[in-house]
């Protein structure tokens, strides 16, 4: 039950995280015009990964896409790449994890296969989250560097007479969305990996073996009862996951690679 909950929660958290990563990637407010200690302009500038926007005092907003690929800063290209990789890995992870969910039964898929898929999706979510966090952090670092550079020469004098307003940019809402979303995807991935350990028993506990007493067709399922002899008990103090009431045929599955430590 706990494993199913952990897996389900991991899936939901990752789903929210990936939705957040997609939202952050699409958002225009990666950097916003810094209004602190700056002349109050009647227009407000903000920029995203794909376009820059200007909101005028009338409320009219005009956005212009970056229609060049080669002319863009390498760092911006890197951030775009990281976010897209994060989204792609996250999307694949979600697809894999749907089939890996314990609560969803697909044909006669074994627990070992589900464990594999859960682990795979978990790793994908972790990498996806890390990509998003890395992308957002690279952009944030770029902003901080540019902020202090523009602060150093905020007003560039021309003959001491004319001043030029230097537009400084600070962290936009998308950065915070990206950081939170990346963190959630990462947490979801870790939860999936933890759920995978529960799905796959770490030692052979003879759960699937039928012991036939001579002349009788009675099947003993060691570990099912808390026998005082300790026979079939979890000698290593590790939780044995009993998948619930099943028919004998269902229980008799072949040992998988997860049964051997």
């Amino acid at each position: 039950m706990a494993v199913t909950a952990c897996q389900g929660l991991g899936f939901v958290v990752s789903l929210i995280g990936i939705a957040g990563i997609i939202a952050a990637t699409c958002m225009d407010q990666w950097s916003t015009q810094d209004l602190y200690n700056n002349p109050v302009t009647a227009v407000f500038n903000y920029q995203g990964l794909w376009r820059s926007c200007v909101r005028e005092s009338s409320g009219f907003t005009e956005c212009r896409g970056y229609f060049t690929l080669l002319g863009l800063p390498a760092m911006l290209q890197a951030v775009r790449a990281l976010m897209i990789v994060g989204i792609v890995l996250g999307a694949i992870g979600l697809l894999v994890s749907i089939f890996a969910l314990k609560c969803i039964r697909i044909g006669s898929m074994e627990d070992s296969a589900k464990a594999n898929m859960t682990l795979t999706s978990g790793i994908m979510f972790i990498v996806s989250g890390l990509c998003a966090i890395a992308g957002v952090s690279v952009f944030a670092n770029m902003l901080v560097t540019n902020f202090w550079m523009s602060t150093a020469n905020m007003y560039t004098g021309m003959g001491g007479m004319v001043q030029t307003v230097q537009t400084r940019y600070t962290f936009g809402a998308a950065l915070f969305v990206g950081w939170v979303a990346g963190g959630l995807t990462l947490i979801g991935g870790v939860m999936m990996c933890i759920a995978c350990r529960g799905l796959a028993p770490e030692e052979t506990n003879y759960k699937a073996v039928s012991y036939h007493a001579s002349g009788h067709s009675v099947a003993y399922k060691p570990g099912g009862f808390k026998a005082s002899t300790g026979f079939g008990s979890n000698t290593k103090n590790k939780k044995i996951y009993d998948g619930g009431a099943r028919t004998e045929d269902e229980v008799q599955s072949y040992p998988s690679k997860h049964d051997y430590v």
Partner: antibody, heavy 120, light 113 residues
């Protein structure tokens, strides 16, 4: 067609207050900001403040040090500008103007002006 | 506040001739975000409110004759009337439409020579 009709001329004593109204018609009042500009005799135009309906934000020229208050009555499609603690140098023609949304980004329609005379 | 300086204060030009009015701002009116200059030109005739001519330094308002044109960027701007007509006699104002408080130039009185 777009029209901004202002209230009539006023004569005020120093220290008093004046409230000028500006009734808009021919467009959706809540879509466009209203700006207030004054012009003293023989002087340049002077921006006083504005009201932005899209975010209910009001901006004022610091020069007026809290003496000016811009309000509006949406149901009557009317904007108001109140100037308090009047002095003789406040004698001017007061204009309301509509700031266009998008293109042009400017004050595209103006009221006819309200002459306010401050005299003891 | 941004100081807008217009020159000349008054200008007398013959009918059909070119009239040029200059405007200089103490700070750049160029917005880096969209590379637009937020400078506006108005025409004011005696006893009338100002009339919008040019916005964003070079865009002509609809209904304004094409003999009116605006140019310039950053801090230096020009209003040009290519062929002066009798109805163009007025005072012309440039305005900073970028940084609060919005400020106007002192005006240039255009007359016929």
């Amino acid at each position: 067609q777009v029209q901004l009709v202002q209230s009539g001329a006023e004569v005020k004593k120093p220290g008093a207050s004046v409230k000028v109204s500006c009734k808009a018609s021919g467009y959706t009042f809540t879509t466009y900001p209203i700006e207030w500009v004054r012009q003293a005799p023989g002087q340049r135009l002077e921006w006083m403040g504005n009201f932005h309906p899209y975010n209910d934000d009001t901006k004022y020229n610091e020069k007026f040090k809290g003496r000016v208050t811009i309000t509006r009555d949406t149901s009557a499609s009317t904007a108001y500008m109140e100037l308090s603690s009047l002095r003789s140098e406040d004698t001017a023609v007061y204009y309301c103007a509509r700031r266009a949304y998008g293109y042009p980004y400017a004050m595209d329609y103006w009221g006819q002006g309200t002459l306010v005379t401050v005299s003891s | 506040d941004i100081v807008m300086t217009q020159s000349p204060d008054s200008l007398a030009v013959s009918l059909g001739e070119r009239a040029t009015i200059n405007c200089k701002s103490s700070q750049s009116l160029l917005n880096a975000g969209n590379q637009k200059n937020y400078l506006t030109w108005y025409q004011q005739k005696p006893g009338q409110p100002p009339k919008l001519l040019i916005y964003r330094a070079s865009s002509r308002e609809s209904g304004v004759p094409d003999r009116f044109s605006g140019s310039g960027s950053g801090t230096d701007f020009t209003l040009t009337i290519s062929s002066l007509q009798a109805e163009d006699v007025a005072v012309y104002y440039c305005q900073n439409d970028y940084i609060y408080p919005y400020t106007f130039g002192g005006g240039t009185k255009l007359e016929i020579k």
